[in-house]
Each structure stands twice: as C-alpha cells, then as structure tokens.
C-alpha cells in the first residue's frame, strides 16, 4: 500500500512536470534507493545540479533569457570539481556565458543567483578581469586550460544553463 | 573638448579599396571603445565596426566581414578602417563615433562630422 | 538583429506643442530594469547628436523639453514644449545586442 501511494504520488508529479520538459532522466538514489533525481533530457547532472550547453551564439542577457525559460539560469560554478564535471563537455575552441556579471563596470561581480561572489573560488585566467567595458564572464580554453574572461556582454557567445535537480 | 575628425573619403571604383582615419582628441582615446557608422544615402544609420578600448576586440556586422578592417594606433589617437572589395551598396557618410559602455550594452556620446565614400564606376 | 520600427515618419507639430516619436523594437530591449534603448537627433549637414541614454536618462547639456520612456520593446521620446531649433531627423538605437541597429529616422518639422 505504502509503494502504491509513492508510485501514485510520483506519477503525478511527473505529469506535472511533463508540461514543462517532455523528457526526465531520472536516477534511484538516497539511502534506501527511494528517491529518484531527475534531470531534463538532454541536461547533463553533477551532484544536486542538471547542466544544458548552448550552442546557439546569443548576448549575455539573451542567454540568461533563455536559461530562464527553460526553469534555469546561466551557470554559477561554486567549487573547482563543478567547473572540472562542466568542461568535460565543452568545445576547447569555444567561449560560453557564465551567470556572472558586472552590469555597472565597478569590479563588482555578481551571480545571477545571488550566491556570494567569493574571490578565493575564482577561476580567471592570468591577467583577468581587465576592463571595466568587459562586464559578462565567459569561460574558455587558453593556455592549456579552462578559466574565466571578461567580455562584452552583447556580443554573441554560446552558453551554459544550470538548474536544481528535480526530487520525485 | 572631445573632437572626433574623420578624413580619406573619395570616390573608389566598384572592387577599390580606401583607408579612413579619424583623429581623436579631447578625451584619453585608449581607454574608450570606438565605432565606425555610416549613414546611407536614403538617411538610414548601419554600424560597420567596432574596436575594444585595449585594441583586443573588433566586430563587423555580416555586411562588411572579410572587406573592413577596424584598427587603432592609441598612440597617434587615430582610429582607422581599412575598406576593400568595396560595392556601390557601400556608398554613404562614414562617421567615427566613441562608445560609451552601460550596463549590459553602450551607446555613442560623441560622433565626428564624417567623411563620405562614393563607390562608382 | 533587432529590427526597430519608428513612427511616424515625419511629423509637423505647431511651436509649443507636444512633439511623441515611438520606437518599436522586434524584441525586447530590457534586462532586469535596465532598458537599451537610446535616442539621437539629427539636423541637415550634422552628425547625429546623443539626446538619451537607456530609454530615459537626458545626456548632459541636453534641454529638459526632452524625455524618454518605454520598456521592453515600446519606447517613446517626448519634445514638449517644441521649440524652432527642434526641426531634425530623430533616431532610436538598441544596444542590448550585436549588431546595434537603428531605427529608420523619425524627420519633426516646425510649423
């Protein structure tokens, strides 16, 4: 009776869901193996997060648009293991929009989730930031390996998106 | 007082090439972004290219990729667009114009009186 | 791009009066409160001329009979009260994205 009514509850909850992505991948976890995490399809999942690249080339605001419509926002990367899991899937010749910015040119960034912006879990490459018109981060290949750069925000650029996965 | 001074304007044969400069002063020249605009000759406003303050960014809309070059001696306080393959379509007043940054995008606080391209056989 | 459609065309508004030019734009303009949308003016054998910056700040030196407003992708530029100088071709510019573009022209005679 108890597996029928968590059976019942989460085929409800997936209806729910359904109106808003189509496809769920979803993977048994927590102590008893009861509870499923969930991540729209294609999204990719690390820890409590599901990740989606963007290759279409958009602005910044425009990527965060468009993260947002999809339940998202652009990526806040919180600890190196997190950037690490994201540029496994990265192009090395491409840039793509991180959630952080510096709309007033000050040097004062900020996530678009309003998570703290920590400067000792930093990843900018050598010499950056280096100018206050460069208010919207990327991250990108250079020097053997992947960092952060300011650059303008309306030039178009790909993008990653990052939500909380989905409990069922 | 900013003053924005644009000169190389001529007329070019379709296929031609042509050098504009502008000379900045008035303002610390390296550390603004700068643009060139041209204004057609039915009046209408179409950007043509774009150089970042530290000379480490340039964009072109699709209309002029691979024909224009945008370059900067900061030194000389000149801005430059170096035109090539030109075409009749490319006829118009070419204005230098200083990028002013804000929040997510710019607009132009100050434009030169322009020079002007005739592209005709 | 950002198509931005201008109306009217031209216009004739008596000395005095209220002079309204709309820019529409093709999509939004707008981030968080923060709209790009900026206005110049225009007159025969001149550059164009900054009179606001993001929908509604009034460049410095610039006469307070200008205002401007709108959000998202509605923005207008108010004259008022017009005066003879005013006689020019007005233009919106978006900026939130590459490449800028630019409304078509928005020519306001004096009668």
């Known amino acids: 009776n108890f597996m029928y009514s968590k059976t019942v509850k989460r085929l409800s909850k997936l209806q729910e869901y359904q109106q808003y992505y189509p496809s769920l991948t979803c993977v048994m976890e927590g102590k008893d193996m009861e509870d499923w995490s969930c991540c729209p399809t294609p999204w990719t999942s690390f820890q409590s997060s599901c990740y989606f690249i963007s290759t279409v080339m958009q602005s910044w605001t425009k990527s965060q648009n468009n993260c947002s419509v999809m339940g998202a926002d652009l990526v806040v990367i919180n600890t190196k293991e997190e950037q690490d899991f994201i540029t496994q899937n990265l192009k090395i010749n491409s840039a793509y929009f991180l959630g952080l910015s510096d709309p007033k040119g000050w040097r004062h960034w900020q996530w678009v989730d309003q998570t703290p912006y920590n400067k000792n879990v930093t990843f900018w490459h050598s010499g950056e930031p280096n100018s206050p018109d460069e208010r919207c981060a990327i991250i990108n290949f250079r020097s053997e390996e992947w960092g952060w750069n300011d650059v303008h925000c309306h030039v178009p650029q790909k993008s990653i998106c990052k939500m909380k996965k989905i409990y069922i | 007082e900013v003053q924005l001074v644009e000169s190389g304007g001529d007329l070019v044969k379709p296929g031609g090439s042509l050098k504009l400069s502008c000379a900045a002063s008035g303002f610390t020249f390296s550390s603004y972004g700068m643009s060139w605009v041209r204004q057609t000759p039915d009046k209408r406003l179409e950007w043509v290219a774009t150089?970042?303050?530290?000379?480490?960014?340039?964009y072109y809309p699709d209309s002029v990729k691979g024909r224009f070059t945008i370059s900067r001696d900061n030194a000389k306080n000149t801005l430059y667009l170096q035109m090539s393959s030109l075409k009749s379509e490319d006829t118009a007043m070419y204005y230098c114009a200083r990028q002013l940054y804000y929040s997510y995008g710019y607009y132009f606080d100050y434009w030169g009186q322009g020079t002007t391209l005739t592209v005709s056989s | 791009d950002i198509v931005l459609t201008q109306s009217p065309a031209s216009l004739a508004v008596s000395l005095g009066q209220r002079a309204t030019i709309s820019c529409r734009a093709s999509e939004s303009v707008s981030f968080h409160g923060t709209h790009l949308m900026h206005w110049y003016q225009q007159k025969p054998g001149q550059p164009p001329k900054l009179l606001i910056y993001a929908a509604s700040n009034l460049e410095s030196g610039v006469p307070a009979r200008f205002s401007g407003s709108g959000s998202e992708t509605d923005f207008t530029l108010n004259i008022h009260p017009v005066e003879e100088e005013d006689a020019a071709t007005y233009f919106c510019q978006q900026s939130i994205e590459d490449p800028p573009t630019f409304g078509g022209g928005t020519k306001l005679e004096i009668k």
């Open positions: 150089i970042s303050s530290g000379d480490s960014y340039t």
